[in-house]
């Protein structure tokens, strides 16, 4: 199991900047369509955050399809997309605290919290349910702990967050992250698995923040939340590396990392555009 094939690595940087799409179609999966032609086209991959080649069948498909690599980059990438955010955990707020509220492109509107840099406090906002950016927290407490100034500057303690009650939750409603660990990945990795509202039974994976592992669950096909991945590998890539182990001696911050030294990516496996 590749999950066990890990080593300790000192963290020097965090995730890529939060994914903020210029056009919503850039989030669509590559779609070769029903026809049988073999045509070289390009699409924007939200996992790698790069324009990549794919084979198009010649008909139908979707708007995430471009004749050239240049056209794809022009439509879907930003100049700073590959810049790594550097952050000093003990003194500074994470960079994402300074991002503006971003409702994302979906329409399953829910209450979330963001750090308002103008008022210097965490406030609620209307979130669409997908994409957006990392200045997005499920609870006021989580937002305050990460982004508001504590008595000694940026606080990294007490990262545990209370999980919302959701239908068919697979994780406890009120769960604190063990004190030995702190979570610095996407906030949805801390949310319970959510079957959603439809009737399908699709095999998916969610990150169980209590046990620190990706676990299977049955997804209904619509709704739910972003803690929802089509493969265990994508789940691990998105959430597993967020857990930072605190080592008291010398104060080194370490994390478990797979040997493959890829950057942590924010995974948006499915994008559900729905009206509540």
């Amino acid at each position: 199991d590749s999950e066990e094939d890990e080593e300790h690595t000192i963290i020097t940087d965090t995730e890529l900047p939060p994914l903020k799409l210029m056009h919503s179609f850039c989030a669509f999966k590559a779609d070769d369509g029903p026809c049988k032609a073999i045509m070289k086209r390009f699409f924007f991959n939200i996992f790698t955050r790069q324009c990549e080649e794919f084979i198009y069948g010649g008909c139908e498909g979707n708007q995430n399809r471009f004749e050239s690599l240049e056209e794809c980059k022009k439509m879907c990438t930003r100049d700073n997309a590959n810049r790594i955010i550097k952050t000093t955990l003990q003194q500074e707020k994470p960079d994402f605290c300074f991002l503006e509220e971003d409702p994302g492109i979906c329409r399953g509107y829910i209450t979330r919290y963001f750090y308002n840099n103008q008022t210097k406090q965490c406030e609620r906002f209307k979130y669409g349910g997908c994409l957006g950016n990392m200045n997005n927290f499920e609870t006021l407490e989580e937002c305050k702990n990460i982004c508001e100034d504590g008595p000694n500057g940026f606080q990294v303690d007490n990262y545990g967050t209370q999980l919302n009650a959701v239908n068919n939750s697979l994780t406890p409603q009120s769960t604190k992250v063990p004190s030995l660990f702190e979570f610095h990945g996407p906030s949805w990795c801390l949310t319970p698995a959510d079957r959603g509202l439809c009737r399908a039974n699709e095999n998916r994976f969610y990150y169980n923040s209590v046990i620190g592992k990706c676990r299977p669950f049955k997804y209904s096909g619509c709704g739910g939340n972003e803690n929802n991945f089509t493969s265990k590998q994508e789940c691990l890539r998105a959430c597993k590396k967020g857990f930072i182990q605190r080592i008291s001696k010398g104060g080194l911050i370490k994390t478990k990392r797979k040997r493959k030294k890829q950057r942590v990516k924010i995974a948006y496996e499915e994008i559900f555009v729905k009206n509540m």
Epitope: Y109, T111, Q118, T119, N164, A165
Partner: antibody, heavy 119, light 108 residues
Framework: EVQLVQSGAELKKPGASVKLSCKAS????????MHWVRQAPGQGLEWIGE????????NYNEKFKTRATLTADKSTSTAYMELSSLRSEDTAVYYC????????????WGQGTTVTVSS | EIVLTQSPATLSLSPGERATLSCSAS???????LYWYQQKPGQAPRLWIS???ILASGVPARFSGSGSGTKYTLTISSLEPEDFAVYFC?????????FGQGTKLEIK
Amino acid sequence: EVQLVQSGAELKKPGASVKLSCKASGYTFTSYWMHWVRQAPGQGLEWIGEIKPDQGRINYNEKFKTRATLTADKSTSTAYMELSSLRSEDTAVYYCARSSVVDVAMDYWGQGTTVTVSS
Amino acid sequence: EIVLTQSPATLSLSPGERATLSCSASSSVSSSYLYWYQQKPGQAPRLWISGTSILASGVPARFSGSGSGTKYTLTISSLEPEDFAVYFCHQWSFYPFTFGQGTKLEIK
């Protein structure tokens, strides 16, 4: 003392528009959300939308998005709600209510404005 | 949108009796985001309970709230004359924010 004082009753014909006001005092107007909620005769409460005056952030109930317009005048600490294309079912008492930026505890309410739509 | 269904629509009880008002949500809502308001005739609603169980300022201790997921309850342990009013549940977990249709608590 926190107070929300609303404008007087309105009688309108179908198809017309109405603009209601809510003057706030006793607190920092720009630091709170102002909500608009209506109550038809003998009915429940219906949320129309909210506005945060400092940055002009507005959230509408989709049902009212095409007909309701929320605005705020920071200089007079007054919130406004305009409702267009009025119909008889818009007959209701319209309330303004404030809440903090972190929750939706509507802790202070205006006295309400009665809007009657009749031909 | 989340539909909140309150039951019963009208509850007729005498002072001193125990009252149980229910609020059922069409989908699960966070207990932190479930509130109750009291309204008396000719008056604006008043915030009564926040976060499922936290009594607003000035609300007597005979009131209590409980619940989670889709089922929430407001309980009055022993009714006093001033408790007779309409009570609305309210959720702000999802947009648009919604209210129940209300339960009228009347004197028997």
